[in-house]
């Protein structure tokens, strides 16, 4: 998270951290007592690792009394993604059990109504992804808000051009921006999933390359079909 | 299908003012911008302005600033320009265009002839 | 605003000769988040332009491989391997990354 702040401790008990071998590799939300949903193309990045999925932790490296870590029983990433885009870019991920849920670790209600959220809206992102361009890694978890940013400016020439399809949703980036390592986490509109950061290799922070998130009501029929 | 529909061709008079529209389909009408664009009879082209059909906020090239007014009807997917005091130098075809990607979808052009 | 100079103004091809456009702009088009912005349009007769090339390399899709794209800063350049007789036409080269955009002022490519 680019320009934001630490994260009020456990206060985002949704939170999921999705690890290779033991690092933090992508964001990821809980969305049922054994499924967090996160993005597609983080598996890419993770080649023949062990993927685990962390619950209930605000510090990576420090014990904390609700941290969890789950093996992950499967893997399911949307059918139609694929490496070279950022359509679809969704993964459910099944916990080798179900979560024990509690104060630091609860499921986030999502969106399953397919309508746009209204421009200028301010959501919250959260992750531990970089917080510099230098790429320094946080330890904590960080949080910033964003702006909604209308589709037809998001897909301006000087934007994203036309890579923006109704699946998909924009936030600004002005300074303040999601970056690597927040794929698969979470954005949140007024305490409902609207969006799950895509991983893509955007530049982060620059206003002319707003962030990009898949919408999930525009999913809801598959996430009910996996999660069923 | 993306198609842009132009309004057809116009002769005015001169003093007087003109309004053709830009009828899209095949898409959601307020993902992307609609531009504008000029061109003389065997001239190149030159670009008017752009509108954002969510909020109807608009750029214009300084030179079109008071001559060209872009406007938008969401209800029925349609970008409108108005062209006023229009003189022979505005005779033209007027082109709309999408952007994203690019100017990759135009309309066929709207031939404007002011003539007394 | 970015002036776009074209040369040459009209260029005679044989079909299957190769044919070259230069597009040359008064300052740097590259946009402040380190794109270029440099497109190529093609315009036949009596219709709208077609996009050929974006981001000074890209084909669009559709566009045939015989058409490339290069350059950088303020020159660049359209070739064209094999010209077909459905290549005829003006073309036109935009700069996007300054407002307002800026034409070039065309090449008719036709027949020698």
């Known amino acids: 998270i680019l320009g934001g702040r630490e994260a009020e401790a456990h206060a985002r008990p949704y939170m999921a951290s999705v690890q290779v071998n033991g690092e933090h590799l992508c964001g990821g939300v809980l969305v049922a007592e054994q499924w967090v949903l996160s993005a597609a193309h983080c598996l890419e990045d993770a080649a023949d690792g062990k993927v685990q999925v962390l619950l209930g932790a605000h510090s990576l490296s420090q014990p904390e009394p609700s941290k969890r870590l789950y093996d992950v029983l499967r893997a399911v990433p949307h059918p139609d993604s694929r490496p070279d885009t950022i359509d679809h870019d969704l993964l459910l991920l099944q916990l080798s059990e179900k979560a024990t849920l509690g104060p630091a670790v609860r499921p986030l209600p999502w969106q399953r109504v397919d309508r746009d959220v209204e421009p200028g809206t301010l959501c919250d992102v959260a992750g531990w992804g970089i917080v510099s361009h230098a790429g320094r890694r946080p330890d904590r978890l960080q949080h910033v808000l964003l702006p909604v940013l209308d589709r037809a400016t998001c897909n301006r020439r000087t934007h994203h051009d036309g890579a923006i399809t109704q699946r998909m949703m924009c936030a600004e980036s002005n300074r303040r921006d999601s970056c690597k390592g927040d794929s698969g986490g979470p954005l949140v509109c007024g305490g409902v999933l609207e969006g799950v950061v895509t991983s893509g290799s955007r530049v982060c922070g620059n206003r002319k390359k707003p962030g990009i998130y898949t919408r999930v009501a525009s999913y809801a029929a598959w996430i009910d079909s996996v999660l069923a | 299908e993306v198609q842009l529909q132009q309004s057809g061709p116009e002769l005015v008079k001169p003093g007087a003012s003109v309004k053709i529209s830009c009828k899209a389909s095949?898409?959601?009408?307020?993902?992307?911008?609609k531009n504008w664009m000029r061109q003389r009879h065997g001239e190149s082209l030159e670009w008017i302005g752009d509108?954002?059909?969510?909020?109807?906020?608009?750029n214009y090239n300084q030179k079109f600033k008071g001559k060209a007014t872009l406007t938008v009807d969401k209800s029925s997917s349609t970008a409108y320009m108005e062209l006023r005091s229009l003189t022979s130098e505005d005779s033209a075809v007027y082109f709309c265009?999408?952007?994203?990607?690019?100017?990759?979808?135009w309309g066929h052009g709207t031939l404007v002839t002011v003539s007394a | 605003d970015v002036l776009m100079t074209q040369t040459p103004l009209s260029l005679p091809v044989s079909l299957g000769d190769q044919a070259s456009i230069s597009c040359r702009s008064s300052?740097?088009?590259?946009?402040?988040?380190?794109?270029?912005?440099l497109e190529w349009y093609l315009q036949k007769p009596g219709q709208s332009p077609n996009l050929l090339i974006y981001k000074v390399s890209n084909r669009f899709s559709g566009v045939p491989d015989r058409f490339s794209g290069s350059g950088s800063g303020t020159d660049f350049t359209l070739k064209i391997s094999r010209v077909e007789a459905e290549d005829l036409g003006v073309y036109y080269c935009f700069q996007g990354s300054h407002v307002p955009p800026t034409f070039g002022g065309g090449t008719k490519l036709e027949i020698k």
């Open positions: 509108i954002n059909p969510n909020n109807g906020d608009a």
């Open positions: 300052q740097t088009i590259v946009h402040s988040n380190g794109d270029t912005y």
């Open positions: 265009a999408r952007e994203g990607p690019s100017f990759a979808y």
């Open positions: 095949g898409y959601t009408f307020t993902d992307y911008y």
